[in-house]
Interface confidence: low
């Protein structure tokens, strides 16, 4: 999936299986990613688990779990708030669109989480105070906390190289991270479809083009569109909402530039 | 050198602010200081020359004498919470306000700095 980190870096990751997205003193978010096509390096999120840890007089431990075709509007125990404690309403789930869009507000840690199902796969977005982001027991064990550190270099897809290949008129099939680029989606069509929803040619737009060329699944256009919309709602600095490509500092990493 | 871990555990254990515990919190504060001292001793070998480490060691001694804490006595279990930030709050942990981050944050300083993370597509 595409990852926008807390530090506004933008990466395309091929991480497969279960990975920690957030892991701090207050909550733990884990995603499970699966290949979008058999044999493909590109993966998308098929399962999401959020654990809100027990916290003082506010909330009991609560688990939220979403999977493909199952986006619940309640925690695993059936409740919609933080339990029986005095401040239980400082954690709430709201269903925005049945089966498609859920918002979780954790006021006790100043955090808002948006989970969506777009097509077959899930998207995740969070707004969180810096102080909560950095509230970790052991900074040494933070290595694989994706939202903070990004994904490991060997798990990144070289977005720019892929795009350069895609733009050239006769691109070899091997240039794509997926074994077969669906013939139904020539580069020009992918560009046109993404332009429709994402008029600014930023990294969300580039991600959209990448996804259409990789999978041929038009739902990924909506995934990129909603990711940007959620960013509009959740990012505190509107000037940094659109991220643009710049010269890479590391191979495979697409860094942010406001 | 795990001094930052010791520091964050100390902050967690002293939600009423490390420099001015409420008078009824002093035994708990002293217990937190002893735990902090123990943590720094455990990490001492790997912290030679680390400024934060030495700063912490001296500060513990200073704070213990300021609050008349005995070197021996019970230690504390660190609480999970590291918020609100160390300051002059006398807020008790069972206050409903603690369940509203922004309200408890505004008591201490300017609005919190928010960050955003997102995951989507393939």
């Amino acid at each position: 999936p595409h990852l926008r980190t807390f530090t506004d870096h933008f990466q395309t990751c091929k991480v497969q299986g279960a990975w920690p997205l957030i892991d701090n003193n207050y909550l733990n978010v884990q995603v499970t990613n699966t290949p979008v096509l058999p044999g493909s390096a590109a993966t998308a999120t098929s399962k999401l688990t959020i654990i809100f840890k027990n916290f003082q007089e506010c909330v009991d431990q609560k688990v939220y779990q979403a999977e493909m075709d199952e986006l619940p509007s309640a925690f695993a125990d059936g409740s919609k708030n933080g339990g029986d404690k005095h401040g239980a309403n400082s954690l709430k789930i709201t269903e925005k669109v049945s089966g498609q869009h859920v918002e979780i507000q954790a006021k006790y840690i100043g955090t808002t989480i948006v989970v969506r199902q777009v097509g077959r796969y899930l998207t995740f977005a969070v707004r969180m105070p810096e102080e909560v982001v950095n509230a970790v027991e052991d900074r040494d064990s933070q290595g694989l906390y994706l939202c903070l550190r990004g994904c490991p270099l060997n798990q990144q897809i070289d977005f720019q190289a892929f795009r350069a290949n895609a733009e050239s008129p006769r691109r070899p099939a091997a240039a794509s991270p997926s074994p077969v680029v669906p013939e139904t989606f020539p580069y020009e069509t992918a560009v046109a479809k993404c332009k429709e929803k994402l008029p600014v040619e930023d990294l969300y737009y580039q991600a959209c083009v990448f996804d259409l060329l990789t999978t041929g699944d038009v739902n990924f256009t909506l995934a990129a569109y909603y990711a940007l919309e959620d960013g509009k709602m959740l990012h505190s600095n509107k000037d940094k909402l659109h991220l643009f490509e710049r010269t890479r500092e590391l191979p495979g990493a697409v860094a942010a530039a406001a | 050198c795990k001094i930052l871990k010791c520091n964050s555990e100390f902050w967690s254990a002293t939600s009423s602010g490390s420099h001015a515990p409420a008078s009824d919190d002093v035994p708990e504060f002293c217990a937190a200081l002893r735990t902090y001292a123990l943590c720094t001793r455990r990490t001492a070998r790997t912290c030679r020359g680390d400024l934060a480490y030495h700063s912490a060691v001296h500060g513990i001694e200073d704070l213990m004498s300021q609050h008349n804490c005995s070197k021996d006595g019970p230690t504390s279990q660190p609480r999970v919470r590291t918020l609100p930030p160390a300051g002059d709050s006398q807020e008790r942990s069972d206050s409903p306000e603690i369940c509203h981050y922004e309200k408890s944050f505004h008591k201490h300083s300017a609005a919190p700095n928010y960050t955003h993370c997102g995951l989507f597509g393939d």
């Epitope: 530090t7 950095n134 900074r139 | 930052l4 010791c6 520091n7 100390f10 902050w11 490390s18 902090y36 030679r48 020359g49 680390d50 400024l51 934060a52 030495h54 700063s55 912490a56 060691v57 001296h58 500060g59 513990i60 001694e61 200073d62 704070l63 004498s65 930030p85 300083s109 300017a110 700095n113």
Partner: antibody
Framework: EVQLVQSGAEVKKPGASVKVSCKAS????????ISWVRQAPGQGLDWMGW????????NYAQKLQGRVTMTTDTSTSTAYMELSSLRSEDTAVYYC?????????????WGQGTLVTVSS | QSALTQPRSVSGSPGQSVTISCTGT?????????VSWYQQHPGKAPKLMLY???KRPSGVPDRFSGSKSGNTASLTISGLQAEDEADYYC?????????FGGGTKVTVL
């Protein structure tokens, strides 16, 4: 009142050494580190190193390693910074500063500064 | 060349807000909880204005505030006053090194 009082201005020849003192009062000397920071004329602040009066531990900026020596005398609550093999670019105001205690790191009290001029 | 980059100068009229940025690396700023800011008037010693990124020592007016995003720390002075005209330095403790920014001259127009 917490105070750091430094020794007076010095004029030195290239190749010589200078020793600046910093007398602390109003707090427990061994409870705080002492940092040394210098500022060349019209330039920014430049961290030189740090000493713990409690343990004698020092931590020097890499570029000054071998030329700088920091010491303390706990009986008089005084910190010293000695810089050897002086060159013209060492001309600066030298400040001592108290390091905040506990799990905090900042320089909360500063001396008035000592001007050291290196000139042939 | 300083390891922490600050703008050379910023200016504003009385009552306005100004923000000074301090950009470093992930180890010097991004991962550091030890970012402090100092004010220095000409011919005077520096004065601590903020520590631990956002905390204000007693005696520092609340118009001074700090924040951090990624590898950039910022000092904001809201409601600028004539006495705020000075040089401002960011400082970060990273590992065993203490780094200062090159300094920013704040001018009150």
């Amino acid at each position: 009142e917490v105070q750091l009082v430094q020794s007076g201005a010095e004029v030195k020849k290239p190749g010589a050494s200078v020793k600046v003192s910093c007398k602390a009062s109003g707090y427990t000397f061994t409870s705080h580190g002492i940092s040394w920071v210098r500022q060349a004329p019209g330039q920014g602040l430049d961290w030189m190193g740090w000493i713990s009066p409690y343990s004698g531990n020092t931590n020097y900026a890499q570029k000054l390693q071998g030329r700088v020596t920091m010491t303390t005398d706990t009986s008089t609550s005084t910190a010293y910074m000695e810089l050897s093999s002086l060159r013209s670019e060492d001309t600066a105001v030298y400040y001592c500063a108290r390091v905040g205690s506990g799990p905090y790191y900042y320089m909360d009290v500063w001396g008035q500064g000592t001007l050291v001029t290196v000139s042939s | 060349q300083s390891a922490l980059t600050q703008p050379r100068s910023v200016s504003g009229s009385p009552g306005q807000s100004v923000t000074i940025s301090c950009t470093g690396t992930s180890s010097s700023v991004g991962d550091s909880i030890y970012v402090s800011w100092y004010q220095q008037h000409p011919g005077k010693a520096p004065k601590l204005m903020l520590y631990d990124v956002t905390k204000r020592p007693s005696g520092v007016p609340d118009r001074f505030s700090g924040s951090k995003s990624g590898n950039t720390a910022s000092l904001t002075i809201s409601g600028l006053q004539a006495e705020d005209e000075a040089d401002y330095y960011c400082c970060s403790y990273a590992g065993t090194d203490t780094l200062f920014g090159g300094g920013t001259k704040v001018t009150v127009l």
